[in-house]
């Protein structure tokens, strides 16, 4: 009596259980009463990531540099290529199909939250006692240098964009 269901890694065809092709291989011909399933490895830049009966392998994803993308992990016959964004950009989705430019925080502002895979940079003004002298998508506000701990005195006050300038203490003659 012909089977109605097959074991794992098999499929039913013509009232017969045939072996699926392993990941990285595609189906060339179904098994018969006398022959095994015939499978063939995927070509260069192709993959199949499951036990399958596909007659065509999938093309590896293309990480388009014009969209700010680069290859993070090159695909194999069993896995797709993984794209990520170039430095200074972030993915527009978890799948990272395209990138957008990180917002930079201007001098006087620091990064409150660095851009994540799916959200842009969040900036905050540097409070009193802190400064940022660069336009950056990474740098937080830095605390002013403590002149006292270096046995120096403040010669020039700091701002939200500049550090304090320390100098030697006046010596009594």
């Amino acid at each position: 009596e012909p089977p109605t269901a097959c074991r794992e890694k098999q499929y039913l065809i013509n009232s017969q259980c045939c072996s699926l092709c392993q990941p990285g291989q595609k189906l060339v011909s179904d098994c018969t009463e006398f022959t095994e399933t015939e499978c063939l490895p995927c070509g260069e830049s192709e993959f199949l990531d499951t036990w399958n009966r596909e007659t065509h392998c999938h093309q590896h994803k293309y990480c388009d540099p014009n969209l700010g993308l680069r290859v993070q992990q090159k695909g194999t016959s069993e896995t797709d290529t993984i794209c990520t964004c170039e430095e200074g950009w972030h993915c527009t989705s978890e799948a990272c199909e395209s990138c957008v430019l990180h917002r930079s925080c201007s001098p006087g502002f620091g990064v409150k939250q660095i851009a994540t895979g799916v959200s842009d940079t969040i900036c905050e003004p540097c409070p009193v006692g802190f400064f940022s002298n660069v336009s950056s998508a990474f740098e937080k506000c830095h605390p002013w240098t403590s002149c006292e701990t270096k046995d120096l005195v403040v010669q020039q006050a700091g701002t939200n964009k500049t550090d304090v300038v320390c100098g030697p203490q006046d010596r009594l003659r």
Epitope: T76, T84, G88, T116, G117
Partner: antibody, heavy 116, light 112 residues
Framework: QSVKESEGGLFKPTDTLTLTCTVS????????MIWVRQAPGNGLEWIGV???????YYATWAKSRSTITRNTNLNTVTLKMTSLTAADTATYFC???????????WGPGTLVTVSS | DIVMTQTPASVSAAVGGTVTIKCQAS??????LAWHQQKPGQPPKLLIY???TLASGVPSRFKGSGSRTEYTLTISDLECADAATYYC??????????????FGGGTEVVVK
């Protein structure tokens, strides 16, 4: 661009180790971060990796007692390892993982000693 | 488990000579491979990524080659400064795979 691990130190057997790695000069949302350790006189031993979507992969020996997390606000990656034994004595490194098109960045490492 | 097997464990060669280090992955890692150099008391230093791309500042005496499961690091015109331990590292991660150690066991290069 730099990566730096928090201070290690002396731990007792059964203690839990928590190490924090702080990155600066790059957005780690585009990179994978790894933890690696090296016992005295031994080779490099990979512990695990976290990717930009917070997916984690662990070495089979580390899976049951290691957790790697990221905090994008603080720009940090944390390794938590439970049930320490003397065999966990090593220098622990955090690194921005090398990938197919970009080089990695290693931290200087921090020494963790487990002894009763 | 994906296992990285590195050979030889140690190799010795004269200044000006050539050494070849091999790394075998237990499955196809698709050129997602790096080579690192480590000297005592220092963190590793990246030499090569993507199986054959030279990292910034690394001299062209270092050459990476190979594909799929077999990879090679060749150091030519050996210098005394090349004395170090060299490690291969798989940068290939897949939900369907597990990993014992993504690093090879290391090769100590002695320069005579």
């Amino acid at each position: 661009q730099s990566v730096k691990e928090s201070e290690g130190g002396l731990f007792k057997p059964t203690d839990t180790l928590t190490l924090t790695c702080t990155v600066s000069g790059f957005s780690f949302s585009n990179y994978r971060m790894i933890w690696v350790r090296q016992a005295p006189g031994n080779g490099l031993e990979w512990i695990g990796v976290i990717d930009r979507n917070d997916n984690t992969y662990y070495a089979t020996w580390a899976k049951s007692r290691s957790t790697i997390t990221r905090n994008t606000n603080l720009n940090t990656v944390t390794l938590k390892m439970t049930s320490l034994t003397a065999a966990d004595t090593a220098t622990y490194f955090c690194a921005r993982d090398t990938d197919y098109t970009t080089g990695g960045i290693w931290g200087p490492g921090t020494l963790v000693t487990v002894s009763s | 488990d994906i296992v990285m097997t590195q050979t030889p464990a140690s190799v010795s060669a004269a200044v000006g000579g050539t050494v070849t280090i091999k790394c075998q992955a237990s499955q196809n890692i698709g050129d997602n491979l790096a080579w690192h150099q480590q000297k005592p008391g220092q963190p590793p230093k990246l030499l090569i990524y993507g199986a054959s791309t030279l990292a910034s500042g690394v001299p062209s005496r270092f050459k990476g080659s190979g594909s799929r499961t077999e990879y090679t690091l060749t150091i030519s015109d050996l210098e005394c400064a090349d004395a170090a331990t060299y490690y291969c590292q798989s940068n290939y991660y897949s939900t369907s795979s597990s990993y014992y150690n993504s690093f090879g066991g290391g090769t100590e290069v002695v320069v005579k």
